[in-house]
Interface confidence: low
């Protein structure tokens, strides 16, 4: 008689990453009987929601349900119907919503309330929508990449299953760049974390980790650009801003009201004699780099060592995974290879920024102009942030690995968030036999 295949005993989870510029839905899957093993959860789907981030719906909250429909529909298709009721759905909102909450707690709550109502219409086990802290965002990103790299597993392998894996159990640091914030998280070497706000203690799979993390609000690539424009327009003699961070020949009109809409530009706000100004690109990497450095206040530090703006940063230690916009931008610029030195990256950026806008548009005809126009700034900003902000050097640059996916799962905070909320990372090392959830205290 022929053997009948047994039905897969699997579980699913859904996490929505409600970022400042867009929302993405991730579907994760794992074998039910192995949920406490390290490395068994993997991503089966990513669905990017069409449209901006949820914070942009503040004046049109009634459209949120429709905005989320396509990706939630996709989840209904991907996850077997029999599993819908057991599949948890989590939505985490990041810095875009943190900024909205700074402006108005009531408006932020209203957006989240409508998001919750929309998501609870679906047949899944909706577990809530919340604004996660910058510390959580950093911590969950760190958990994600180390979980996927197999760093929490006590079994040393004689072979490497992932490209960045060294056989030791040293964890990777995590560098995350979003639109509105950026996070740095790593285990410092025998270094006291001098500011309690930046210290995290984890016990994972029987091992203790003392982790440093900080989230720099307003230093995501989009908000950093708004900051730079607000700073530079202060000294413009008229409503023309000759900007080295945009390609020669590029022109764009900016509303002053849009510039001052975000809390991130408040420190540069002034009464201008015009309602609009025009950016005119001049494409000069060196000048762009100098302008960006003015966003980092390095003149004071109440600790032994700081990143910028008086924030404690211990000496860098070990390898780092740089993901999200660090990866997307560098991938577009073709600078993610391990073989490309920091000097080479800088040279490439100089050439790229100097290219005329018309030439750039022709070379990258398939790319939306809004995104295309900002790669010179974003690439330069990444270099400035990593080198001057976090104190990477030409030598330590080779310890930065620009990572999009690991083992088919996106690097980012969402997997770590779900692993934590579903209690799938035990404090103690599991026994070799799979045990039920209740075994872990």
């Amino acid at each position: 008689t022929q053997n009948k295949a047994l039905p897969e005993n699997v579980k699913y989870g859904i996490v929505l990453d409600a970022g400042s510029s867009h929302t993405s839905l991730y579907i994760y899957k794992w074998p039910a009987e192995k949920e406490n093993d390290t490395g068994v959860v993997h991503q089966v789907e990513e669905c990017r929601v069409k449209g901006p981030g949820i914070s942009k719906f503040v004046q049109k909250v009634n459209e949120i349900g429709i905005y989320l429909t396509d990706c939630m529909e996709r989840a209904r298709e991907v996850i077997p119907r029999s599993q819908h009721q057991e599949t948890p759905v989590y939505l985490g909102a990041t810095a875009g919503m943190r900024l909205l909450r700074m402006e108005s707690e009531e408006l932020a709550d209203r957006v989240l309330d409508v998001v919750e109502r929309s998501l609870s219409n679906y047949p899944f086990d909706f577990q809530g929508a919340r604004i996660i802290t910058g510390q959580e965002e950093g911590a969950y990103g760190w958990i994600t990449i180390n979980y996927l790299l197999g760093k929490f597993s006590q079994k040393t392998r004689w072979f490497s299953i992932v490209p960045y894996e060294t056989n030791n159990q040293e964890t990777f640091g995590a560098l995350d760049l979003g639109g509105a914030s950026t996070q740095v998280t790593f285990v410092p070497q025998n270094q006291t974390i001098e500011s309690p706000d930046n210290a995290l203690q984890f016990r994972l799979y029987g091992k203790d980790y003392n982790v440093y993390t900080h989230s720099f609000l307003c230093y995501g690539k989009d908000q950093a650009l708004w900051q730079k424009l607000a700073k530079d327009i202060q000294v413009a003699s008229n409503e023309i801003l000759r900007d080295p961070c945009f390609h020669p020949g590029y022109k764009k009109v900016v509303n002053v009201s849009d510039l001052y809409k975000t809390p991130c530009t408040k420190r540069f706000e002034m009464t201008l004699p015009f309602q609009q100004f025009e950016i005119q690109g001049i494409g000069n990497y060196q000048q762009c780099h100098q302008s960006i450095l003015e966003l980092f206040n390095t003149s004071y530090c109440p600790y032994s060592q700081c990143a910028f703006n008086g924030i404690f940063l211990p000496p860098l230690q070990g390898d780092f995974g740089a993901f999200s916009a660090f990866y997307f931008v560098m991938k577009f610029l073709n600078l993610t290879s391990e073989k490309v030195s920091q000097e080479k990256v800088t040279e490439m950026m100089k050439k790229f920024c100097a290219q005329p806008w018309e030439e750039i548009k022709t070379s990258y005809a398939g790319v939306k102009e809004k995104y295309l126009s900002e790669y010179c700034f974003s690439g330069t900003y990444i270099l400035s942030l990593l080198l001057q902000g976090y104190h990477f050097t030409a030598d330590s640059w080779e310890h930065i690995h620009f990572i999009g996916k690991i083992q088919g799962s996106d690097a980012g905070w969402t997997l770590g968030y779900m692993l934590n909320l579903t209690n799938m990372i035990p404090a103690e090392q599991p026994l070799s036999t799979p045990l039920s959830h209740s075994t872990y205290v």
Epitope: N62, G65, I66, T69, S120, D125, F126
Partner: antibody, heavy 119, light 107 residues
């Protein structure tokens, strides 16, 4: 065949309490969210409350918040509406209806049970 | 809350006649609208969901359509069992809201 049967209606004095039930059959009750909808005499339909399949999500119309409690017992395939501090304006026919995502929003209804609030 | 304005509130028509009822949403509901029929004995039945999709078992003479924020229910040729009350329902957001209803009577 999908069946929803409401019961528990009756005559109550203002300020009084009553608990309505809705017995479900012919479908997997624990898969579905459930609603209570009411209709005052000679008036239109008014949505009252919703409870998700696992009871984790609950919504009420503003006029009943703090007075009505929706609940369910999936083991017994039954939906409830506990009503307290009743007012004359709560007098209505109360219907239960099921809900499973957008294709199945309020797609099957019970026949209703009557509540009269009067002194 | 989303207001649903239904018109007309009552309508007299003859057998075989074509009639249309309309609902207007105060905010965008993206097609998340259904039409319900309530018979004189109080029985409620859903006829249409997602603005234009016919429920199984509902006669083809019923149809739904959308034009911007206006949603219509059309009965192409009235039959005696169609004389009833009709309600639209939006399910784009909570609270769910109904139109005021249309009473369809025999002329």
């Amino acid at each position: 065949e999908v069946q929803l049967v409401e019961s528990g209606g009756g005559l109550v004095k203002p300020g009084g309490s009553l608990k309505l039930s809705c017995a479900a059959s012919g479908f997997t009750f624990s898969d579905y969210g459930m609603h209570w909808v009411r209709q005052a005499p000679e008036k239109g339909l008014e949505w009252v409350a919703y409870i998700s399949s696992g009871s984790s999500v609950i919504y009420y119309v503003d006029t009943v918040k703090g007075r009505f409690t929706i609940s369910r017992d999936n083991a017994k395939n039954t939906l409830f509406l506990q009503m307290t501090s009743l007012r004359s304006e709560d007098t209505a026919m109360y219907y239960c209806a099921r809900d499973l995502y957008y294709d199945h929003v309020l797609d099957s209804w019970g026949q209703g049970t009557t509540l009269t609030v009067s002194s | 809350d989303i207001q649903m304005t239904q018109s007309p509130s009552s309508l007299s028509a003859s057998l075989g006649e074509r009639v249309s009822l309309t609902c207007r949403a105060s905010q965008e509901i993206g097609g998340y609208l259904s039409w319900l029929q309530q018979k004189p004995d109080g029985t409620i039945k859903r006829l249409i969901y997602a603005a234009s999709t016919l429920d199984s078992g509902v006669p083809k003479r019923f149809s739904g359509s959308r034009s911007g924020s206006d949603y219509s229910l059309t009965i192409s040729s009235l039959e005696s069992e169609d004389f009833a009350d009709y309600y639209c329902l939006q399910y784009a957001s909570y609270p769910r809201t109904f139109g005021g209803g249309t009473k369809l009577e025999i002329k």
